[in-house]
Each structure stands twice: as C-alpha cells, then as structure tokens.
C-alpha cells in the first residue's frame, strides 16, 4: 500500500494505491483511492507512467479527457466513472501488454486539495495448472499443465506423504512457446507416483505462484488448484 499526500498551496489530500500485476492479453486494474469530493465536476484524475510523456488517462469535469493521452494507451483505458464521486480513481487497463509494466502515478485534484501516489505495475502471464494422471505412460505418472506463463517460471513437485522430498530427479519440465511468441505453455511430468498420496505441482515466477493438487486413491481422484499474485503492496 502506498499512501501519498498532497503538495503545497491548497490542502493536501490522501491518495492510496496498491501495487499489482497484469496478465498479458487480459484486462487489469491499477488501484487508486482518494478522499472523495461532493462535486464530480471538481475532481480531476490523471494517471501518468514513468518514462511516458503523454498521459495514460485523464478524467475531468465528469468525463474522460483524452487529448493528451499517449498513443500506447489509446483505446485501452477507462476509469469507473460512477465510482469517482466516492473516491475511486482506479484505472481499468484493457489488453495488458508486456510494455505496460512500470511505475504509475495516480494524481488527484479536488476542491479540498491535491495529492498523488505511485504504484508498481508488473506484467507477465500466469494461469492455473491442472494436474492429471497420465494413463498413456508405462508407469504411474502425473502430468501438470498450465497454458500461459511469462517470465519462465520454476516448477517444483511436492507430496504430502514424502514432505521435503526432492522430486527433481523423477520429474521432467518443458516450456513450449505459444503462438504469440511471448508466453509459454508449462508441462511438467512426475514419474513413479504412489497411490493414496496427494501431490502438488507448484509453478512460480516473480509475478505469481500457482499450485495444482491431485489426490490419488484407489477409488477416486480429487483435484484442486489456486493462484496467488505476489508483491501486492499498497502505497
């Protein structure tokens, strides 16, 4: 969390941002809140990006003001116009690009004063893994697949029964470049698995950590997966 305060002159207002990550090709949110004003027409929101001289987005007098927008953000940004009055200056960023990563500033002017706060925005690709029993293999084998990751992640297998065991010798991980030539499909195979055990395939890069679990018993197979974004700090 980053909390910024205003500058000299008028009173300062508190502006709060939260560091976040965007998934390439999907929509993302750059979070920013501020002390609300009673009059929408008195609120100005400017989003800026370090190293970019045009604006990312501007909202003033109750509507978007895009004459100064940098072309790299053209047609891809929107504020939640109906929530500005309650102090929400968050920016929706459509079709996140790798180059959108960087330091952004949320700058607010209201009748009460001015304020700003920075946020770090990371971009990459992350997806939920799915673990399945590979019935085509000669021995009991598990196959963990996740369709989109970037940068290249690490893959670690773990087991509930053999806690702390190193499975690197009995696993094989491959990365296949996807058609857009940025993200990669992750495939990891674990050999010599035993039944009545829960195995976890953990995929991690500097943006996200995802885990796919599979519990194999004689009578059933249970799966569970979850994904967690790393370094979500507020400012």
């Amino acid at each position: 969390l980053i909390i910024g305060f205003g500058i000299s002159g008028r009173h300062s207002i508190t502006v709060t941002t939260v560091a976040s990550a965007g998934n390439i090709g999907e929509d993302g949110i750059l979070s920013c809140t501020f002390e609300p004003d009673i009059k929408l027409s008195d609120i100005v929101i400017q989003w800026l990006k370090e190293g970019v001289l045009g604006l990312v987005h501007e909202f003033k007098e109750g509507k978007d003001e895009l004459s100064e927008q940098d072309e790299m953000f053209r047609g891809r940004t929107a504020v939640f116009a109906d929530q500005v009055i309650v102090g929400n200056a968050s920016l929706r960023l459509k079709n996140v690009q790798l180059t959108d990563a960087g330091t952004y500033k949320c700058y607010i002017i209201t009748s009460k004063g001015k304020g700003n706060a920075n946020l770090e925005y990371k971009t990459g690709a992350f997806s939920m893994p799915e673990v399945n029993v590979d019935y085509n293999a000669s021995s009991e084998t598990l196959r963990c697949e996740a369709p989109r990751w970037f940068p290249q992640p690490t893959v670690v297998w773990a087991s509930q029964v053999d806690q702390g065991a190193n499975f690197s010798e009995v696993s094989n991980t491959s990365f296949e470049l996807n058609s857009e030539n940025v993200t990669m499909k992750v495939v990891s195979v674990l050999y010599n698995v035993t039944i009545n055990n829960t195995y976890s395939c953990m995929i991690e890069n500097d943006i996200a950590k995802a885990t796919g679990d599979i519990k194999v018993t004689e009578s059933e197979i249970k799966r569970r997966s979850h994904l967690q974004l790393l370094n979500s700090k507020a400012s």
Partner: antibody
Framework: EVQLQQSGPELVKPGASVKMSCKAS????????MNWVKQSHGKSLEWIGR????????SYNQKFKGKATLTVDKSLSAAYMQLNSLTSEDSAVYYC?????????WGQGTTLTVSS | DIQMTQTTSSLSASLGDRVTISCRAS??????LNWYQQKPDGTVKLLIY???RLHSGVPSRFSGSGSGTDYSLTISNLEQEDIATYFC?????????FGGGTKLEIK
C-alpha cells in the same frame, strides 16, 4: 516563450553523413517528446520519428529506420538528428517539433542539400 | 500506416470568404486530428488540435470539426495573412502521417 532553434543549412556529398541540431528554450526540455519531420521540395510532410528527452527512448517511422538516428543532450536542452549514407533523395527541409499527439511548436527548419 | 488525404490541393478564395478544407483518414482516428499552417517562408504553426481545439494564440476565425475518418478546417472570414498551405495530421497511431496539403490563394 517556447522556441526551437535549428542549425543552419547543410550542403553535403552523396554517401556522407550529417548531424543537425534543435535547441529548445522557454519550457522544460524533458517534459515533451521531440519529433523530426521531413519535407521534400514542394511536397508534403513525413514524420521521421521522435525522441523522449527524459530517457533517450526513440520511436521511428519504419521508412527512416537505419537512415536517421535521434539523440538528445539534456544539459544543453538540445535534440539531434543524424542522417547517414546520404543520397539526393535526402535533400529536403527537416523540422523539429515538440510534443506527442499534436506537435505544437516547430523549429524554422534546416535545409539539407545532397550534391556532388 | 494511416493514409491522410486532402483531395483539394489548391483553393482560390476572396478576402472575407468562408473557406473549408477537408481531410480524410484511411481509418477511424478517434478525433486525433490536427491542422497546421505553413507560410511561404516555411514557418509551420499548429492551428487546431484534437479535431476542434484552438491552439493558444490562434485567431477564433479558425475552427475544426469532424469525427471518425472525415475532418475539416474552416476559416470563417478569410484574411490576407491566411495565405498559406494547410496540412492535416493524424495523431492516433504511430507513425504520425500528414495529408498532402491544401494551398490557399487569393482570387
């Protein structure tokens, strides 16, 4: 008052290189992109590319990649364009102009003549 | 690249006339259309940006309009000092591109 002062006319031989300058005053140099635009005799305007004076980052028109190199010197508030392997096709007036979506202030132009 | 077309390359008008110069883009440019004036000595000035916004110091007789792919510049009361060539430019997508220009002359 915003001013962009460009270097004087150049007469150079084919195959040579030339470096022209654009000195900015009346505003904070690092706050605005600097564009370069070509105008061949009696013709329209062609955008060559632009440079970000705050970090030296450049964007080029594909047509001028390898022909033009854009640089800045922050300490002098000056932008430069080098043109290499010159031919008669490069004879033109070259303008610098600041800002991104709508170049709002333009230099007076530098006339380049390529002739043996 | 986005092509910008000014169909009229030269235009004759009388002082006091209302003159309209048009410009067409090969695709929607979302109002990112600018107009420039180039005097015979080569001096280039921005007149209108973002379709209809008057640049500082530009006389109010100049106005701009349009949307999508079709845009125009209007001079409401032509003066001698308006004799120049007028260029449109799209600022929507790199590379920025210009129209071929419209040369305005006095009848």
């Amino acid at each position: 008052e915003v001013q962009l002062q460009q270097s004087g006319p150049e007469l150079v031989k084919p195959g040579a290189s030339v470096k022209m300058s654009c000195k900015a005053s009346g505003y904070t140099f690092t706050d605005y992109y600097m564009n370069w635009v070509k105008q061949s005799h009696g013709k329209s305007l062609e955008w060559i590319g632009r440079v970000n004076p705050s970090n030296g980052g450049t964007s080029y028109n594909q047509k001028f990649k390898g022909k033009a190199t854009l640089t800045v010197d922050k300490s002098l508030s000056a932008a430069y364009m080098q043109l290499n392997s010159l031919t008669s096709e490069d004879s033109a007036v070259y303008y610098c102009a600041r800002r991104h979506n709508y170049p709002d202030y333009w230099g007076q132009g530098t006339t380049l003549t390529v002739s043996s | 690249d986005i092509q910008m077309t000014q169909t009229t390359s030269s235009l004759s008008a009388s002082l006091g006339d209302r003159v309209t110069i048009s410009c067409r883009a090969s695709q929607d440019i979302s109002f990112y259309l600018n107009w420039y004036q180039q005097k015979p000595d080569g001096t280039v000035k921005l007149l209108i940006y973002y379709t209809s916004r008057l640049h500082s110091g530009v006389p109010s007789r100049f106005s701009g309009s349009g949307s999508g792919t079709d845009y125009s510049l209007t001079i409401s009361n032509l003066e001698q000092e308006d004799i120049a060539t007028y260029f449109c430019q799209q600022g929507n997508t790199l590379p920025w591109t210009f129209g071929g220009g419209t040369k305005l002359e006095i009848k």
